[in-house]
């Protein structure tokens, strides 16, 4: 079957990093600089991405393979192979369209990257909050009120300074 | 234009070895892929052997562990060795790189 397709299609026989040359009588030629062909029996070799800018490059192009890129410092991936750079954000703030603000009261961002989301409603599962939630850091639910021995409190005294949540005037 | 240059052909026996040449002159950049093809009477020009843009020598499954390209930027020239020649390797080997090719060299491997 191989030496029929070859037969019928000699572009079939053209390997990775070449092209099947059409204004050459069909005949396999390598891919051009900054250009690659990942596959055989390609009739054109890809141009080589570049990582220009807020991007930077992970993997350099080859005559078989394309450049990877990343991110630079302050910046994450977005898309697939990471198609967009996306700005960082600290924990406890989330990336609007005026740039980074702080996590409304009742919600957290732990990472970087994403959206502040909001605390875990602990008595939803019957539980009591343990310790506070944060713009950081989302509640800790403990056990059950009723779980409780009576006169334990199950809440941590709140940190001396601003209340959770809000940023800083 | 690039003016390329095949020698080092010859008749051999199975078996034996022949070093083949390409000499370049004009401008020929070093990020220019190198290739070695071969011609067999009543057949298709075949690609053989290339070193690609990004300096990596390939080979198609012909020459795979029987020839070796090599090539050196400052003498403009480029080598196919050929070790283990068989009788279906006889045929005319041409150099090529960009557009240019050279008048080829026939390689005929005989006992």
């Known amino acids: 079957f191989e030496r029929t397709r070859s037969l019928q299609d000699p572009c079939s026989n053209c390997p990775a990093g070449t092209f099947c040359d059409n204004n050459r009588n069909q005949i396999c030629s390598p891919c051009p600089p900054n250009s690659f062909s990942s596959a055989g029996g390609q009739r054109t070799c890809d141009i080589c991405r570049q990582c220009k800018g807020v991007f930077r490059t992970r993997k350099e192009c080859s005559s078989t393979s394309n450049a990877e890129c990343d991110c630079t410092p302050g910046f994450h991936c977005l898309g697939a192979g990471c198609s967009m750079c996306e700005q960082d954000c600290k924990q406890g703030q989330e990336l609007t369209k005026k740039g980074c603000k702080d996590c409304c009261f009742g919600t957290f961002n732990d990472q970087k990257r994403g959206i502040c989301r909001p605390w875990t409603n602990c008595s939803l599962d019957g539980k009591s909050v343990l310790v506070n939630g944060t713009k950081e850091r989302d509640v800790v639910c403990g056990p059950s009120p009723a779980d409780l021995s009576p006169g334990a409190s199950s809440v941590t005294p709140p940190a001396p300074a601003r209340e959770p949540g809000h940023s800083p005037q | 234009a690039v003016q390329l240059v095949e020698s080092g052909g010859g008749l051999v026996q199975p078996g034996g070895s022949l070093r083949l040449t390409c000499a370049a002159s004009g401008d020929i950049f070093s990020s220019q892929p190198m290739s070695w093809y071969r011609q067999a009477p009543g057949k298709r020009r075949d690609l053989v052997a290339w070193?690609?843009?990004?300096?990596?020598?390939h080979y198609t499954d012909s020459a795979k562990g029987r020839f070796t390209i090599s090539r050196d930027n400052t003498k403009k020239t480029t080598w196919l060795q050929m070790n283990s020649l068989k009788l279906e390797d006889t045929a005319v080997y041409y150099c090529?790189?960009?557009?240019?090719w050279g008048q080829g060299t026939q390689v005929t491997v005989s006992s």
């Open positions: 090529a790189s960009g557009d240019s």
């Open positions: 070193i690609a843009w990004d300096n990596i020598a």
